[in-house]
């Protein structure tokens, strides 16, 4: 058939067969998940830092009043 | 027609029909938006931390001068 | 020609004509830029926070020794 | 052959030949790697900030008890 002789379609098959777009989308979503997790960890650290700072401020302000 | 017999074209249809590239691009842009929002939240936390630190420094330096 | 009758090829044209993969790759790279710039801004804020903390530590340790 | 006359297939070849999806996936993974490295650097900075804060708290609480 004409397809058998077509280098263009052979190229289409060659290039895209291994990674259909579903896989690409899955990769993008996986990357999102990973980065969101990393950012979540940063967020948790920051919450901890805010707490430490609140404690420091509490100590300093209680000293000022005493 | 020749298309009916073509496993290559069937594969093209099979792989790409469900997720056209517009959807992939939309996914990428959506991921960007989400991650930017997360980073913005971190930024807001950091601004708060900077304020707390400025207050601590203010207390400490005012003590030094008194 | 056979192509004119092919719903599969019509679909290929429909799905992929507007967003060639170059555009998709460019979109991914653009997203990287934006996120890197946002992270750079966070980094600058953190550097400032580290400096403020170093100054606080300096004040506290100089007090201890006096 | 029919392919030679097909603007649709010419478009497929024109748009997609240079960037097979493997390349797109590689780009996504490369971007992930870079952003993860940047976030790792932020994480390291935060760990340092937490240590500085712990030291400040230690100094302040040791003063309170003395």
């Amino acid at each position: 058939s004409p397809q058998d002789r077509s280098p263009i379609l052979a190229e289409v098959k060659h290039s895209f067969y291994p990674i259909p777009e579903q896989t690409l989308q899955a990769t993008v979503l996986e990357v999102r998940h990973e980065l969101k997790e990393d950012i979540k960890a940063l967020n948790a650290k920051m919450t901890n830092i805010e707490k430490q700072l609140s404690e420091i401020l509490r100590i300093l302000t209680s000293r000022r009043s005493s | 027609s020749p298309q009916d017999r073509s496993p290559i074209l069937a594969e093209v249809k099979h792989s790409f029909y469900p997720i056209p590239e517009q959807t992939l691009q939309a996914t990428v842009l959506e991921v960007r938006h989400e991650l930017k929002e997360d980073i913005k939240a971190l930024n807001a936390k950091m601004t708060n931390i900077e304020k707390q630190l400025s207050e601590i420094l203010r207390i400490l330096t005012s003590r030094r001068s008194s | 020609s056979p192509q004119d009758r092919s719903p599969i090829l019509a679909e290929v044209k429909h799905s992929f004509y507007p967003i060639p993969e170059q555009t998709l790759q460019a979109t991914v790279l653009e997203v990287r830029h934006e996120l890197k710039e946002d992270i750079k801004a966070l980094n600058a804020k953190m550097t400032n926070i580290e400096k403020q903390l170093s100054e606080i530590l300096r004040i506290l340790t100089s007090r201890r020794s006096s | 052959s029919p392919q030679d006359r097909s603007p649709i297939l010419a478009e497929v070849k024109h748009s997609f030949y240079p960037i097979p999806e493997q390349t797109l996936q590689a780009t996504v993974l490369e971007v992930r790697h870079e952003l993860k490295e940047d976030i790792k650097a932020l994480n390291a900075k935060m760990t340092n900030i937490e240590k500085q804060l712990s030291e400040i708290l230690r100094i302040l609480t040791s003063r309170r008890s003395s």
Epitope: - | L29, R32, H33, K36 | Q25, A26, L29, E30, H33, E34, E37, D38, K40, A41 | T27, E30, E34
Partner: antibody
């Protein structure tokens, strides 16, 4: 077809101000970061400013504090507000799509001279 | 800032000849490099992005290669239409910086 059309260039005295505009069409403007690039009379190309799709702005040090970049997504327009202009700001100013500068407009000439 | 050193600054080549222009970055730019062609009185046009990816509508006789700090643009068989100035741009780290340009003329 992607089209970027700049306007607002002209002759201005040192210390003066000028606002450039860029009308974009042929793509979803709100999805893209946009940039300004300039070409000096010596044909040297310089990145001037970028703005992300959601409005975050970026500048090189030599224009920071003097130039502001903004966008109007509803009207598909990009702006560059330039103030405290110097003779070294004399250049052809191009509006471009993305951080990667994938498409350029035809440019608008800015001349800073007494 | 990352400095981009482009060479040669100008060159002459014959029709059909293979031409290579190089750009060296002062540090690793991880393939975040684009190549542009500018004809007299026209705005630049993108040829290559991400070091090796051919932009839409660019003939396949033009190619980009390189990684790390060293990159090159190659025209496999020079045509009269290739008379222009070529620039590289690194967009790996802001501030984004351009090479000084290479003026290519036909012998």
């Amino acid at each position: 077809e992607v089209k970027l059309v700049e306007s607002g260039g002209g002759l201005v005295k040192p210390g003066g101000s000028l606002k450039l505009s860029c009308a974009a069409s042929g793509f979803t403007f709100s999805n893209y970061a946009m940039s300004w690039v300039r070409q000096t009379p010596e044909k040297r190309l310089e990145w001037v400013a970028s703005i992300s799709s959601d409005g975050d702005t970026y500048f090189p040090d030599n224009v920071k504090g003097r130039f502001t970049i903004s966008r109007e997504n509803a009207g598909n327009i990009l702006f560059l507000q330039m103030s405290s202009l110097r003779s070294e700001d004399t250049a052809m100013y191009y509006c471009a799509r993305g951080f990667m500068i994938t498409f350029w407009g035809q440019g608008t000439l800015v001349t800073v001279s007494a | 800032d990352i400095k981009m050193t482009q060479s040669p600054s100008s060159m002459y080549a014959s029709l059909g000849e293979r031409v290579t222009i190089t750009c060296k970055a002062s540090q690793d730019i991880k393939s975040y490099l684009s190549w542009y062609q500018q004809k007299p009185w026209k705005s630049p046009k993108i040829l290559i992005y991400y070091a090796t990816s051919l932009a839409d509508g660019v003939p396949s006789r033009i190619s980009g290669s390189g990684s790390g700090q060293d990159y090159s643009l190659t025209i496999s068989s020079l045509e009269s239409d290739d008379t222009a100035t070529y620039y590289c741009l690194q967009h790996g780290e802001s501030p984004y910086t351009f090479g000084g340009g290479t003026k290519l003329e036909i012998k």
